[in-house]
């Protein structure tokens, strides 16, 4: 049998946020029902994780031997602290789209570990704020965006923006 440390060396995690409790659930991406040491995990999920606090999980299973895999869960900031904001100026709304992630509330997570991604059509931007210029008037554009903490996606949003009519004579 392999050690659990080896077997789960490359385990990945998804973070799910509960807006009512303001707590996260970490979903462990494994094929079998693992045990989580002191942390109880149900259906490979570790519940009630506080934003920006690290949690240590000891992963074991009867298909592997000691030592267990020690997984450090880097819990992201609360999702409601981020808002996708349309920053397009009214006078330029016929040919321009501006989108910005606003941090309306502080958090204790290291901001260095947060990355932002926008995808508008086939254009990809790794920025917190984007401005698309020289667009076609009266066209619909869809922009998808996500935020990652330590390369784990923890929230996403999409906006469909229709550019205004062009000025007469243009």
């Amino acid at each position: 049998k392999p050690t659990c440390d080896e077997k789960y060396a490359n385990i990945t995690v998804d973070y799910l946020y509960n807006k009512e409790t303001k707590l996260f659930t970490a979903k462990l991406n494994v094929n079998e029902d693992v045990e989580c040491g002191n942390n109880t995990c149900t259906n490979n999920e570790v519940h009630n994780l506080t934003e920006c606090k690290n949690a240590s999980v000891s992963i074991s299973h009867n298909s592997c031997t000691a030592p267990d895999k020690t997984l450090i869960l880097d819990v992201p900031p609360g999702v409601e602290k981020f808002q996708l904001h349309d920053c397009t100026q009214v006078e330029k709304a016929d040919t321009t789209i501006c989108l910005k992630w606003k941090n309306i509330e502080t958090f204790t997570c290291d901001t260095q570990n947060i990355t932002y991604r926008f995808q508008c059509g086939n254009m990809i931007f790794d920025n917190k704020e984007i401005k698309l210029e020289n667009l076609e008037p009266e066209h619909e554009y869809k922009c998808d965006s996500e935020i990652l903490y330590n390369n784990h996606k923890f929230t996403n949003a999409s906006k469909i923006i229709k550019t205004d009519f062009g000025s007469p004579g243009e």
Epitope: N103, I104, E105, T106, T115, N127, K128, E129
Partner: antibody
């Protein structure tokens, strides 16, 4: 190491122009809003310009509006302050400072660069 | 514009004593979102300012717990429970509620008595 390094300060005559630069390193510059803050010879701190992370929004106090322009080049990790129609009261130490968003705080400051406006 | 007035201008203290600095804003700096964006910065001689406190009472990471911030509306206070030699310098309050018209207080110089 997270660092901001200002440059471009000089002695300039009233009515003259000057461009300050602030080189950022050790962090994802394009994710941070940035500001210029100056300190007068009397040691008063004054905020003089603000720019959002992507350069879309800029703000200035009335004392410098129309004379100062803040800009950034995220590809070069550099913040700029173009100053024109300089007055003697613009004499100060100019600091660039990082602010994650408008509702956050200035958590990293540069060491400053000195601008002297005098004939 | 929001005017931030600090008192006293100079504060002579003995090491180990408590120090208290007051900051008063000319109008309420409670934002419509309920938060109060009042910050305190310390500038030591020959250095750039460093953040101590944000949102009235939150200590920035690495700031010793002898520093505490309090207040609401227009009246705010920074307290240092036991002054140490490394605390000497000029303290500035700052309001970030009236975006983008940020304003600093005039500063309070903490010095040895």
């Amino acid at each position: 190491e997270v660092q901001l390094v200002e440059s471009g300060g000089d002695l300039v005559k009233p009515g003259g122009s000057l461009k300050l630069s602030c080189a950022a390193s050790g962090f994802a510059f394009s994710n941070y809003d940035m500001s210029w803050v100056r300190q007068t010879p009397e040691k008063r701190l004054e905020w003089v310009a603000y720019i959002s992370s992507g350069g879309v929004s800029t703000y200035y106090p009335d004392t410098v509006k129309g004379r100062f322009t803040i800009s950034r080049d995220n590809a070069k990790n550099t913040l700029y302050l173009q100053m024109s129609s300089l007055k003697s009261e613009d004499t100060a130490m100019y600091y660039c400072a990082r602010r994650y968003d408008v509702w956050w705080y200035f958590d990293v400051w540069g060491a400053g660069t000195t601008v002297t406006v005098s004939s | 514009d929001v005017l931030m007035t600090q008192t006293p201008l100079s504060l002579p203290v003995s090491l180990g004593d408590q120090a208290s600095i007051s900051c008063r804003s000319s109008q309420s700096i409670v934002h419509s979102n309920g938060n109060t964006y009042l910050e305190w910065y310390l500038q030591k001689p020959g250095q750039s300012p460093k953040l101590l406190i944000y949102k009235v009472s939150n200590r920035f990471s690495g700031v010793p717990d002898r520093f505490s911030g309090s207040g609401s509306g227009t009246d705010f206070t920074l307290k240092i429970s036991r002054v140490e030699a490394e605390d000497l310098g000029v303290y500035y309050c700052f309001q970030g509620s009236h975006v983008p018209m940020y304003t600093f207080g005039g500063g309070t110089k903490l010095e040895i008595k």
